[in-house]
């Protein structure tokens, strides 16, 4: 068998670090057998069999000019093998960050913090951190480690499915190359990394007969679980065209009636979502939707949701008090089940 341990990576390649002493090993001989070393395609003897180094070639302070293919020959001139030298660096700890778009799963991405120049792979795992006792942290068998399954096609991402919202996790991402391994440990709490996707289906409609009103509606992001135990709250911003500043409101449900729109001007509207109890951070803003308040008079048929507003708005009426906001039924999803085992009925 070969005296040369096979490093992780392509066969026939051996590895070293620039500026360091590098030993090349002749693969086709017995350990200690004296060999001669040549650069491939060059007749000059690099190291003879009388060097006392047996089957190894020593390159002091290797640099890029030493990279390439080497040939070793036994005393009788037989080919002992060919070796390709590739120089690079041991792994540095990768940079890791994790994010969650819902409260049941999270993903972690990583980047090398230094390019090694060598074949590299990543080992990804996680364990659930369980604290037992006042100030001792002990592991129970159920806490892992478990593999964090990596995305196919080499994307630097792994996903933990079925995570527990209240638990802490320790992510392990280890960068491995032929010169070693280096590990980054990252402690993750789903509560702190939760950032929902932005709300979807944002629509902005005029309210017939009300030249200062716009009705915006939207839906939960598709990535949020269909029957959520944890709910979302929303933030809505709007502004007239060409106006630099946004006005912000926090709607009670999945729609909002804007009562101070500028008559006749198109308005941009966008919404953002966050966990109902303020875990994590606000989502990015949804794509803007546009709407223009109606200019006509109030219709004879008043929409059911607008029955409170029986007086048409007359512009300009600077001093007139704004009519009461429409009373929106709470959406069933806006009931917080986080601390409740029972289902709460919404009475219409």
């Amino acid at each position: 068998s070969s005296p040369c341990p096979q490093a992780w990576g392509p066969p026939g390649v051996q590895y070293g670090q620039p500026g360091r002493s590098v030993k090349l090993c002749c693969p086709g001989v017995t350990a200690g057998d004296p060999v001669s070393w040549f650069r491939d395609g060059e007749p000059k003897l690099l190291q003879g069999p009388d060097s006392g180094l047996g089957h190894e070639l020593v390159l002091a302070q290797a640099d890029s000019t030493d990279e390439g293919t080497y040939i070793c020959q036994t005393l009788d001139g037989a080919l002992g093998g060919t070796v390709t030298l590739q120089l690079g660096y041991p792994p540095a700890r990768p940079v890791v960050s994790c994010q969650a778009a819902d409260y049941e799963n999270f993903s972690c991405t990583w980047s090398p913090s230094q390019i090694s120049g060598l074949p590299t792979r990543y080992l990804t795992s996680y364990r659930k951190k369980t604290v037992l006792g006042a100030d001792s942290q002990r592991r129970s068998p159920s806490t892992g480690p478990w593999p964090c399954p990596q995305d196919p096609l080499g994307a630097a991402r792994c996903v933990v499915h079925g995570a527990e919202f209240w638990s802490q996790y320790r992510i392990n991402v280890t960068e491995v190359n032929p010169l070693g391994a280096s590990t980054r440990l990252l402690d993750v709490s789903l509560q702190s990394i939760l950032r929902p996707d932005p709300p979807q289906g944002l629509r902005v409609e005029s309210v017939p007969g009300y030249p200062r009103r716009l009705r915006a509606s939207w839906t939960y992001p598709a990535s949020w679980p269909c029957q959520p135990h944890f709910l979302l709250k929303f933030r809505l911003q709007y502004r007239p065209a060409q106006h630099p500043a946004w006005s912000t409101v926090e709607p009670a449900g999945l729609e909002e009636v804007i009562t101070d729109a500028v008559a006749g001007l198109p308005h941009a509207v966008r919404v953002s979502a966050r966990d109902f109890l303020d875990a994590g951070t606000w989502s990015t803003w949804s794509p803007e939707a546009w709407g223009t308040p109606s200019t006509g008079t109030i219709p004879k048929e008043i929409p059911a949701w607008g029955q409170l507003h029986t007086q048409p708005e007359v512009e300009p009426q600077v001093d007139s008090p704004a009519p009461p906001r429409p009373s929106l039924q709470p959406h069933p999803r806006l009931l917080d089940h986080r601390d409740s085992v029972e289902q709460v009925a919404v009475l219409a």
């Epitope: 540095a92 940079v95 980047s111 913090s113 230094q114 390019i115 120049g117």
Partner: antibody, heavy 118, light 107 residues
């Protein structure tokens, strides 16, 4: 010669913006994480921001988050720091520094002075 | 953020003296600590990495030790050119932090 050279510092009013650059030479810039560290006059060192070789991960000190943006152009061997909404407390010498790895700084530039004052 | 405390804040010693600076982290940082030397008007220079490894080209009179939360930096025989401020720094997590520095001068 292995070196880092910062530029772009100067006097700016509070609320203003400035863009710092750091030109790298003598090493394979695209292989290393890069960092900005600052030092207020007569004070200690404060880490500001770092970026991985690919640019895919960045990190900021809480004191600059949302106001500063770190970026790099590997084709130009240059690191940048875009500084917006500047405050008097951002007055400092800004150094750019090279990895190895993340958070380890084995090569520093000479620094560029940023003064925020009205 | 991890806080790094350094002591003393300043010291005076004679040429040839052994000088010791300590650094304490507010939480375990494994061995991910570096020591820097900064001379007036100059950029910092890396002396020690990974708590105890001497950076290439740095004189062997400089050394470091420690792990977890407690770290020590030593100049075995102080030289006139060692007048400077010395900083410890942790890089265990993604937000590195520096100690406040120790100013070293000659008696």
């Amino acid at each position: 010669e292995v070196q880092l050279l910062e530029s772009g510092g100067g006097l700016v009013q509070p609320g203003g913006s400035l863009r710092l650059s750091c030109a790298a030479s003598g090493f394979t810039f695209s292989w290393y994480s890069m960092t900005w560290v600052r030092q207020a006059p007569g004070k200690g060192l404060e880490w500001v921001s770092s970026i991985v070789p690919s640019g895919g991960h960045t990190q900021y000190a809480d004191s600059v988050k949302g106001r500063f943006t770190i970026s790099r152009d590997n084709s130009k061997n240059t690191l940048y720091l875009q500084m917006n909404s500047l405050r008097a407390e951002d007055t400092a010498v800004y150094y750019c520094a090279k990895g190895p790895g993340w958070g380890s700084f084995d090569l520093w530039g000479r620094g560029t002075l940023v003064t925020v004052s009205s | 953020d991890i806080q790094m405390t350094q002591s003393p804040s300043s010291l005076s010693a004679s040429v040839g003296d052994r000088v010791t600076i300590t650094c304490q982290a507010s939480q375990d940082v494994s061995g991910y600590v570096e020591w820097y030397q900064q001379k007036p008007g100059k950029a910092p220079k890396l002396l020690i990495y990974d708590a105890s490894n001497l950076q290439t080209g740095v004189p062997s009179r400089f050394s470091g030790s420690g792990s977890g939360t407690d770290f020590t930096f030593t100049i075995s025989s102080l030289q006139p050119e060692d007048i400077a401020t010395y900083y410890c720094q942790q890089y265990d997590n993604l937000s590195p932090t520096f100690g406040p520095g120790t100013k070293v001068d000659i008696k």
